[in-house]
């Protein structure tokens, strides 16, 4: 029977979320309870790291939301967005794959505010590669698990 | 070994955006630089064509963006869509697979706007159908390979 | 040859689509005519039943819109949600795999408003799960087949 | 691009004092700022930020004494209940564009002595 | 919030210097470091832990992520005596400093 493939759900570990308008490597994700898992590769400080050559499909899932009862929001304009990095650990360097989400005006009357982004795409990566999120305003994260999470899952070998 | 399964991962080609605010198919992808690569598949005036039978799962990320500086947008309540077209050759006809997008009100104090759209689905492809891509506003296009980008790969055969 | 992999690509049964702003199960899709196909799954009473236990992606692409020739939007402030919902029949309970949305006010002076969602994620699923697709404000989805959809495929087998 | 800082001075305790950083060649649009000091002979010590519009983010220290406000090409410090732990080097740094809290232009410091 | 040990060196030019930086909690890899020489405001040197800021010769290095980094200058010259500081750039909630205590460079 063939090896398993690589594979990946990781979702938003929310005790760990971090506060501020700046942009942030997020730092902790879930990799085994709820519909958390991973397979052939490994998550360490909120980095997944690629153990096997291939080309895989690459997913994230970011969901804002605020409510006034938790005060004003940071900034009347907020730039909500989340960038898909792979960082090469031979050669120092972090480069954006995917990047996706919305500028927003949430000084409205309304008294509770949310925004999700997916993004998607399938990509080359090598073994010691690892794949991290960025996401602007992270204090206005949504903890869920099925709001905030990312993936990864090996479609096929390099070659 | 089997053969290796088609896919293609394209990135808009910066040079090439056209201007305007009409919807437009987006004539000009990379397939070789940066994370645009391509196997299996044709890229040909912007379309990609499928050359062996399947069902794939094809992909879009479409971003849009607007610096004040870069002059005012060209109406105060856009339409950012994105249309991921499947054009036959042999009868010549074309459909949409997917849609998305926002209506957006860009007029208002923020000197930057930004909006990005994410589509996914799994369609069952004939070798020779071509698949391209549509947009409204198109001068409004962010041109980094991380935003606006489409692709597909085969997941099975047919039967 | 290999037992073909379990799929779906099932779209909005326009016909049946309901009135309303709560938050609703849609119980009618397509899942043979246009993009509409299920192959190795269950389709009843608008729920995708897994038949084969395995790693499946399971996708969404979810889109409002409302023109002012059918009248006033419910509410200035608009929640357009979208849940996708396991269900396990053995032990009776549900829980949602991934949200997304946006929170809009569609009170402005644009005589046409549309949005769209999309989520994605890679999910253990066991025969007899099932898979369904919540909304809110269904009086608003867009009817058409490249709007409204949800789907899923069968990636790898469990162990 | 630069940053530059002024209103610096001598102030008794108790008084009250606002600083102001000026930047040119960049927006404040477009990058966030921060308010470091650093007294004489120690090390660095965050006070607290400002995004585009935003409301500002203080260190737990700073809260309720320190302001941070911002127009179109300044961003202020104001200080209230000044001591003489007060009394330090202020700097104004710009956050890096692409929105990550990475300090990558600084001034040159102004000067904070708080004294009877 | 940020410990940075040791707080002095001394290291002769040609050769390696590495110390070290703790954050109080798991910060992945949102660190930076700054370099100040007296009478100068600090300079950045690395951010993401590890990257390199424009015009920063390769002889800095930055590793580690989580709560542990290192900072490693190699042929060491006259001009890297300065204090070195680390900064937490994760989250503002519960900071008394983002900044650590410095760890000064002395060049012989």
């Known amino acids: 029977k063939p090896e398993a493939q690589p594979f990946a759900h990781l979702t938003i570990n929310a005790a760990s979320i971090p506060s501020g308008s700046h942009k942030v490597t997020l730092s902790s994700w879930y990799h085994d309870r709820g519909w958390a898992k991973i397979s052939n590769m490994t998550l360490s400080n909120g980095k997944l790291r690629v153990n096997q050559d291939g080309f895989y499909y690459l997913y994230a899932n970011i969901c804002f939301r605020h409510h006034e009862t938790s005060g004003s929001v940071p900034t009347d304009y907020l730039q909500l967005m989340v960038y898909v990095v792979k960082t090469s650990i031979k050669i120092p360097s972090s480069h954006n794959l995917m990047k996706g989400g919305s500028t927003k005006n949430w000084s409205g009357n309304s008294e509770f505010h949310f925004y999700s982004i997916n993004v998607g795409g399938f990509f080359k990566l090598r073994a010691g590669e690892e794949i991290s999120i960025q996401v602007s305003n992270p204090s206005l994260l949504d903890p869920d698990q099925d709001a905030t999470y990312f993936g990864a899952f090996k479609v096929q070998d390099i070659d | 070994k089997p053969e290796a399964q088609p896919f293609a991962h394209l990135t808009i080609n910066a040079a090439s955006i056209p201007s305007g605010s009409h919807k437009v198919t987006l004539s000009s992808w990379y397939h070789d630089r940066g994370w645009a690569k391509i196997s299996n598949m044709t890229l040909s005036n912007g379309k990609l064509r499928v050359n062996q039978d399947g069902f794939y799962y094809l992909y879009a990320n479409i971003c849009f963006r607007h610096h004040e500086t870069s002059g005012s947008v060209p109406t105060d309540y856009l339409q950012l869509m994105v249309y991921v077209v499947k054009t036959s050759i042999k009868i010549p006809s074309s459909h949409n697979l997917m849609k998305g997008g926002s209506t957006k009100n860009w007029s208002g104090n923020s000197e930057f706007h930004f909006y990005s759209i994410n589509v996914g689905g799994f369609f069952k492809l004939r070798a020779g159908e071509e698949i391209s891509i549509q947009v409204s506003n198109p001068s409004l296009l962010d041109p980094d390979q991380d935003a606006t980008y489409f692709g597909a790969f085969k997941v099975q055969d047919i039967d | 040859k290999p037992e073909a992999q379990p799929f779906a690509h099932l779209t909005i049964n326009a016909a049946s689509i309901p009135s309303g702003s709560h938050k609703v199960t849609l119980s009618s899709w397509y899942h043979d005519r246009g993009w509409a196909k299920i192959s190795n799954m269950t389709l009843s009473n608008g729920k995708l039943r897994v038949n084969q236990d395995g790693f499946y992606y399971l996708y969404a692409n979810i889109c409002f819109r409302h023109h002012e020739t059918s009248g006033s939007v419910p509410t200035d402030y608009l929640q357009l949600m979208v849940y996708v919902v396991k269900t396990s029949i053995k032990i009776p309970s549900s829980h949602n795999l991934m949200k997304g949305g946006s929170t809009k006010n569609w009170s402005g002076n644009s005589e046409f408003h549309f949005y769209s969602i999309n989520v994605g994620g890679f999910f253990k699923l066991r025969a007899g799960e099932e898979i369904s697709i919540q909304v809110s404000n269904p009086s608003l989805l867009d009817p058409d087949q490249d709007a409204t959809y949800f789907g899923a495929f069968k990636v790898q087998d469990i162990d | 691009q630069s940053v530059k800082e002024s209103g610096g001075g001598l102030v008794t305790p108790g008084g009250t004092l606002t600083l102001t950083c000026t930047v040119s060649?960049?927006?404040?649009?477009?990058?966030?700022m921060s308010w470091v000091r650093q007294t004489p002979g120690k090390g660095l010590e965050w006070i607290g930020y400002i995004y585009s519009g935003s409301s500002p983010y203080y260190a737990n220290w700073a809260k309720g004494r320190f302001t941070i406000s911002r127009t179109s090409t300044t961003v202020d410090l104001k200080m209230t209940s000044l001591t003489t732990e007060d009394t330090a080097t202020y700097f104004c740094?710009?956050?890096?564009?692409?929105?990550?809290?990475?300090?990558?232009?600084w001034g040159p410091g102004t000067l904070v002595a708080v004294s009877l | 919030d940020m410990i940075q040990t040791p707080a002095s060196v001394e290291v002769v030019v040609g050769g390696t210097v590495t110390f070290n930086c703790q954050a109080s909690q798991n910060i992945g890899s949102n660190l930076a470091w700054y370099q100040q020489k007296p009478g100068q405001p600090p300079k950045l040197l690395i951010y993401?832990?590890?990257t390199l800021a424009s015009g920063v010769p390769s002889r800095f290095k930055g590793s580690g992520s989580g709560t542990q980094f290192t900072f490693t200058i190699s042929d060491v010259e006259c001009t890297d005596a300065a204090t070195y500081y680390c900064?937490?750039?994760?989250?503002?909630?519960?900071?008394?400093?983002?900044f650590g205590g410095g760890t000064e460079v002395v060049v012989k």
């Open positions: 900064q937490q750039a994760y989250s503002i909630s519960n900071v008394d400093n983002a």
């Open positions: 740094a710009r956050h890096v564009s692409d929105g990550g809290w990475y300090l990558d232009i």
């Open positions: 993401s832990a590890s």
């Open positions: 060649g960049f927006s404040l649009s477009r990058n966030a």
